[in-house]
């Protein structure tokens, strides 16, 4: 799903405030509801209709370092005989996600929010007919 | 896929300068990669054997403060006649993503990270028989 | 008009490399997932590689696997057909096929041709 | 791997007649089997998709029908354009696209 454009008001303050000095904001350290997590059926990328292998980049700038793509392993989704069907795609499902970037020149560190696509699994469709107009 | 935890040494300057002080850091304001964009194939949703719906959350203190929640339609797969499958399983594919939370006081903005669990899309998976040790 | 042009084939040697391209007109090249298929001389036809529209999704044949890379630069209306380690039974009229799947998914079934580009592979 | 036979190799018939082509899979393709036509010097042209589906522009005198094993492609009445080699294709298993040897349609 689209993440739309940051406003320029989320930054600022409530109007009768003095404004902000341009460029920069206070980020507080800590995550609120870090130690919430997925519960996600296992081994789904295995047992699905339509598999997925993961591959793992890692970016120690980066908050989260690592970040986990995934990979459709078939062009089509795997029937119950346990072969490839070709008249169903395997297609991959994306979001977009915020990582934290770390900056630093010398002493002066900062961060930045950085707009990331993550294929997080694959879904098995019907395809349809490209009706030309 | 999980987001492990912050560590402390994220936050953290390098040794040989001076402490950074505690709670709070500089946070640049926009967005790195702000207008890259999915590329998933188009009504994934409704063509899925495992379609599903969105349901959106919307939040003015929040960046995104638009989050799009899926819901699988079925617990079964949706087969080739159209009919629910029961013999597969429709299952939610979930991400751990962060969003950008703002918090004021008065005159005082500041921005905090937040774990949040966003279900994706689903997938069609075989059942497997629990085995009782 | 809507039509696909074949061009890069040639005569060349066992072992050596040659590269197709296929220029496509008249219709938003994007939509579509493209293909290769091949005819040997007075023979039948062989499906030899498939891209689909943002080339997350590519196939080949086991006849052409680890020798072919096939891709597509959609800025150009263009594909490519990247031939290493030629064999003689790689002799070929090379044809640029539109998949007709609707979203530029695969639909394996070929809407549109090109008139093809000969490809001979001979010492 | 499916294989796709295609009979007779040859047909020899005159304008007007009708003509009935073959093509038989290995193992099952469901419905999920196309015609194309090729003229000599020219490309393929696709008649018709999941075996009885006309593509866009195919005249009515073409028809396709099976599913399975057997498909059949009629042609009503021939016209002096229809000869040309056909083909048979499958998109229901891996390796995709798999082709017929071909039906040649001549003029007796």
């Known amino acids: 799903r689209k993440i739309p454009k940051v406003g320029h008001t989320f930054f600022q303050k409530p109007e009768s405030c003095p404004p902000v000095p341009e460029g920069s904001m206070k980020l507080d350290t800590g995550i609120i509801n870090e130690n919430q997590r997925v519960s996600m059926s296992r081994n789904i990328e295995s047992r699905s209709t339509s598999p997925w292998n993961y591959t793992v980049t890692w970016d120690p700038n980066r908050y989260p370092s690592e970040v986990v793509q995934a990979q459709c392993k078939h062009l089509g989704c795997i029937n119950a005989q346990g072969k490839e069907d070709i008249s169903m795609n395997s297609v991959p499902i994306q979001q977009e996600t915020l990582v934290l970037r770390r900056k630093h020149q010398g002493c002066s560190v900062s961060f930045q929010l950085e707009k990331v696509l993550v294929t997080v699994g694959c879904t098995c469709v019907t395809p349809v007919v490209h009706h030309v107009q | 896929r999980k987001i492990p935890k912050v560590g402390h040494t994220f936050f953290q300057k390098p040794e040989s300068c001076p402490p950074v002080p505690e709670g709070s850091m500089k946070l640049d304001t926009g967005i790195i990669n702000e207008n890259q964009r999915v590329s998933m194939s188009r009504n994934i949703e409704s063509r899925s054997t495992s379609p599903w719906n969105y349901t959106v959350t919307w939040d003015p203190n929040r960046y995104p403060s638009e989050v799009v929640q899926a819901q699988c339609k079925h617990l079964g797969c949706i087969n080739a006649q159209g009919k629910e499958d029961i013999s597969m399983n429709s299952v939610p594919i979930q991400q751990e993503t962060l969003v950008l939370r703002r918090k004021h006081q008065g005159c005082s903005v500041s921005f905090q990270l937040e774990k949040v669990l966003v279900t994706v899309g689903c997938t069609c998976v075989t059942p497997v028989v629990h085995h009782v040790q | 008009e809507v039509q696909l042009v074949e061009s890069g084939g040639g005569l060349v040697q066992p072992g050596r490399s040659l590269r197709l391209s296929c220029a496509a007109s008249?219709?938003?090249?994007?939509?579509?997932?493209m293909h290769w298929v091949r005819q040997a001389p007075g023979k039948g036809l062989e499906w030899v590689s498939g891209?689909?529209?943002?080339?997350?999704?590519?196939g080949y044949a086991d006849s052409v696997k680890g020798r072919f890379t096939i891709s597509r630069d959609n800025a150009k209306n263009s594909l490519y057909l990247q031939m290493n380690s030629l064999r003689a039974e790689d002799t070929a009229l090379y044809y640029c096929?539109?998949?007709?799947?609707?979203?530029?998914?695969?639909?394996?079934?070929?809407?549109?041709w090109g008139r093809g580009t000969l490809v001979t592979v001979s010492s | 791997e499916i294989v796709l036979t295609q009979s007779p190799a040859t047909l020899s018939l005159s304008p007007g007649e009708r003509a009935t082509l073959s093509c038989r899979a290995s193992?099952?393709?469901?419905?999920?089997l196309a015609w194309y036509q090729q003229k000599p010097g020219q490309a393929p042209r696709l008649l018709i998709y999941?075996?009885?589906n006309r593509a866009t522009g195919i005249p009515a005198r073409f028809s396709g029908s099976g599913s399975g094993t057997d498909f059949t492609l009629t042609i009503s009445s021939l016209e002096p354009e229809d000869f040309a080699v056909y083909y048979c294709q499958q998109r229901s298993n891996w390796p995709p696209a798999t082709f017929g040897g071909g039906t040649k349609v001549e003029i007796k």
């Open positions: 891209i689909n529209w943002n080339s997350g999704g590519i």
């Open positions: 193992q099952s393709v469901r419905s999920y």
């Open positions: 999941d075996a009885s």
């Open positions: 008249g219709f938003t090249f994007d939509d579509y997932a």
């Open positions: 096929a539109r998949d007709m799947g609707g979203f530029g998914e695969f639909y394996w079934n070929f809407g549109l």
